[in-house]
Interface confidence: low
C-alpha cells in the first residue's frame, strides 16, 4: 500500500542534521610499514569560495612515542583559512601559500606545493615517500587524520572512486544533510517520527553509528519515535535529550547504558517502506527524514515537537 506523505525539505530552523563520515568521493589507504616518512595527501574542493577548515592530526602512540615523520600534502582549489592542530607530531606541510592561510603560525616545516594537476601532485608526493593515504573531499568543515592507523591492503595508494577511509580519516561536510518532512495522511494526533536512513558504505566491517538527538521542547510536550535504518553491519549508540520510542535495524544501546545492547527489528530499506513503518507506529508527522552516507556520528537538532511542520 502506498503511503501518502509528500516529503518536502524542511527549513534549517526546524531541523538540521550534521554528520561525520569516512566515506570519500575518491581515496585510498595503503600500508607503508617500514617507511621513515608517512605521506598523506588531501585534495580539498571548496565550491562556494573562501572557507574555514579545522584540520586535526592525531597520532596513535606506539611505545609512547611517535616514531615517524609525517608529510601532509594539502591541495586546495580556493582560499582556505586553516585551523591546524598537530600537537607533538613532526610534521612537514606542503601547500599553496597563496591559497592557504593559518589561524595561527603552524609551527611546522612548510614547503610550497607546485601548481600541478592531481596526478602529478600524487607523483610529487610519492617521490618523497610511500603514500599512506590520499583522499578527495568536497567542502569539508573539519577533518580528522589519524596517523599510524593505515590498515589498507594496498601497498601502493592509487585514488579510487567511492572509498571508505576507515579509521584513517574522518571528516564533516560543511553542508548539513537534506532534511525532509511530511504529514502522514489520515493519522490523527501529534506523534512525530524522525527517520534516519544510513546508506551502505564501501566497507562492510561492523560499525557503530553514534546518533545524537536534540529536540528543543519540554519533555512532556513530546510524543516521538526515532526510526534508524542501516545496513546489517551497523549498530547504533543513541544519545538523546528526550525519551522517545526507538525503532532500529541491528542492535542499539543508549549512551547512558552503553553496555546494554537491545535487539532491533528488520525494517524496510526504502523511503516508502520507512514512511509506512512510521504510519504503523501512529506517527502523524514525519518531522525529519534524512538519508546519509555511512557515518560515524550523526547529530539531529529539531524543534518540531509535535507542532505544525514547516517546510521551506
Amino acid at each position: 500500500e502506498t503511503v501518502h506523505c509528500d516529503l518536502q525539505p524542511v527549513g534549517p530552523e526546524r531541523g538540521e542534521v550534521t554528520y561525520t563520515t569516512s566515506q570519500v568521493s575518491k581515496g585510498c589507504v595503503a600500508q607503508a610499514p617500514n617507511a621513515i616518512l608517512e605521506v598523506h595527501v588531501l585534495f580539498l574542493e571548496f565550491p562556494t569560495g573562501p572557507s574555514q577548515l579545522e584540520l586535526t592530526l592525531q597520532a596513535s602512540k606506539q611505545n609512547g612515542t611517535w616514531p615517524r615523520e609525517v608529510l601532509l600534502v594539502l591541495s586546495v582549489n580556493s582560499s582556505v583559512f586553516l585551523h591546524l592542530q598537530a600537537l607533538g607530531i613532526p610534521l612537514h606541510l606542503a601547500y599553496n601559500s597563496s591559497l592557504v592561510t593559518f589561524q595561527e603560525p603552524p609551527g611546522v616545516n612548510t614547503t610550497e606545493l607546485p601548481s600541478f594537476p592531481k596526478t602529478q601532485i600524487l607523483e610529487w608526493a610519492a617521490e618523497r615517500g610511500p603514500i599512506t593515504s590520499a583522499a578527495e573531499l568536497n567542502d569539508p568543515q573539519s577533518i580528522l587524520l589519524r596517523l599510524g592507523q593505515a590498515q589498507g591492503s594496498l601497498s601502493f595508494c592509487m585514488l579510487e572512486a567511492s572509498q571508505d577511509m576507515g579509521r584513517t580519516l574522518e571528516w564533516r561536510p560543511r553542508t548539513p544533510a537534506l532534511v525532509r518532512g511530511c504529514h502522514l495522511e489520515g493519522v490523527a494526533g501529534h506523534k512525530e517520527a524522525h527517520i534516519l536512513r544510513v546508506l551502505p558504505g564501501h566497507s562492510a566491517g561492523p560499525r557503530t553509528v553514534t546518533v545524537k538527538v536534540e529536540l528543543s521542547c519540554a519533555p512532556g510536550d513530546l510524543d516521538a519515535v526515532l526510526i534508524l535504518q542501516g545496513p546489517p553491519y551497523v549498530s547504533w549508540l543513541i544519545d538523546a535529550n528526550h525519551n522517545m520510542q526507538i525503532w532500529t535495524t541491528g542492535e542499539y544501546s543508549f549512551k547512558i547504558f552503553p553496555e546494554k545492547n537491545i535487539r532491533g527489528f528488520k525494517l524496510p530499506d526504502t523511503p516508502q517502506g520507512l514512511l509506512g513503518e512510521a504510519r504503523m507506529l501512529n506517527a502523524s508527522i514525519v518531522a525529519s527524514f534524512v538519508e546519509l552516507p555511512l557515518a560515524s556520528i550523526v547529530s539531529l537538532h529539531a524543534s518540531s515537537c509535535g507542532g505544525r511542520l514547516q517546510t521551506s
Epitope: 565550491p47 562556494t48 569560495g49 580556493s78 583559512f81 585551523h83 589561524q103 553542508t175
Partner: antibody
C-alpha cells in the same frame, strides 16, 4: 530572526569621509563572515569587501575599486560591523548593504544611501 | 576577475509564462548563487549553490548549470515574481555579480 540594520549614510563632498555602521542581531555575530555590497542608483550589485570571523583573525578583503580608501572593521562585543570610507569619489554614490556570508549571502540589511556630490 | 554576463538584461513576459535567465561566466566556476531584488528593497537570497532554493522560495523556481553556464528558470510566472535577478560567484577571487536581469510584466 536574523536582523541587520545599517546607519550612517548621507551626503558628503568628494574627498570627504563617512563611517557606516551595521547593527546585527539574531545570530552569533562573532562567528559570522560579514560583507558590504553596494548598488549605485539604477545599477547592479557590486561587492565592496569582507571581514571574517574572530576564528579567522578578522581577516579583511576588499574590491580593487575601494582598496586603500575603505576599511572594514567590527566590534564583536557590540555586534556591530563598520565601513570607514575615506577619499570618497562621486562614483562611490550608492546604497550600501551589510550582509552575512554563509556559503552565500543569506541575510541582508535594508541598506543606507551614501551620496558623494559637491 | 571572473565576469558574469546575464542574458537577457530584461525580459517581458505574462503571468503563467515560462521564463529562463542565463548567467555565463568568463571562466569555469564551481557554483552559482542567485538573488531576487524588488525596487527599493534589499536583495533576497533566491537560489544557492546552483540548484538549491533558499528558504521560502516557491518550487516553480529552479536552478541548474555547471562550468560556465548557469540557468534560473521560473516554470509559471506569478505576479510576485516580477523583479530583478542577479547571479553571483565566489569560486574565484574577487566575488562578482552579474549585471542583473529585469523580469517585467508584458
Amino acid at each position: 530572526e536574523v536582523q541587520l540594520v545599517e546607519s550612517g549614510g548621507g551626503l558628503v563632498k568628494p574627498g570627504g569621509s563617512l563611517r557606516l555602521s551595521c547593527a546585527a542581531s539574531g545570530f552569533t555575530f562573532s562567528d559570522a563572515w560579514m560583507d558590504w555590497v553596494r548598488q549605485a542608483p539604477g545599477k547592479g550589485l557590486e561587492w565592496v569587501g569582507e571581514i571574517r570571523s574572530r576564528a579567522s583573525n578578522h581577516a579583511t578583503y576588499y574590491a580593487e575599486s575601494v582598496k586603500g580608501r575603505f576599511t572594514i572593521s567590527r566590534d564583536d562585543s557590540k555586534n556591530t560591523l563598520y565601513l570607514q570610507m575615506n577619499s570618497l569619489k562621486t562614483e562611490d554614490t550608492a546604497v550600501y548593504y551589510c550582509t552575512r556570508w554563509r556559503r552565500f549571502f543569506d541575510s541582508w540589511g535594508q541598506g543606507t544611501l551614501v551620496t558623494v556630490s559637491s | 576577475d571572473i565576469q558574469l554576463t546575464q542574458s537577457p538584461s530584461s525580459l517581458s513576459a505574462s503571468v503563467g509564462d515560462r521564463a529562463t535567465i542565463t548567467c555565463r561566466a568568463s571562466s569555469s566556476v564551481s557554483y552559482m548563487h542567485w538573488y531576487q531584488q524588488k525596487p527599493g528593497k534589499a536583495p533576497k537570497p533566491w537560489i544557492y549553490a546552483s540548484s538549491n532554493l533558499a528558504s521560502g522560495v516557491p518550487s516553480r523556481f529552479s536552478g541548474s548549470g555547471s562550468g560556465t553556464d548557469y540557468t534560473l528558470t521560473i516554470s509559471s510566472l506569478q505576479p510576485e515574481d516580477f523583479a530583478t535577478y542577479y547571479c553571483q560567484q565566489w569560486s574565484s577571487n574577487p566575488l562578482t555579480f552579474g549585471g542583473g536581469t529585469k523580469v517585467e510584466i508584458k
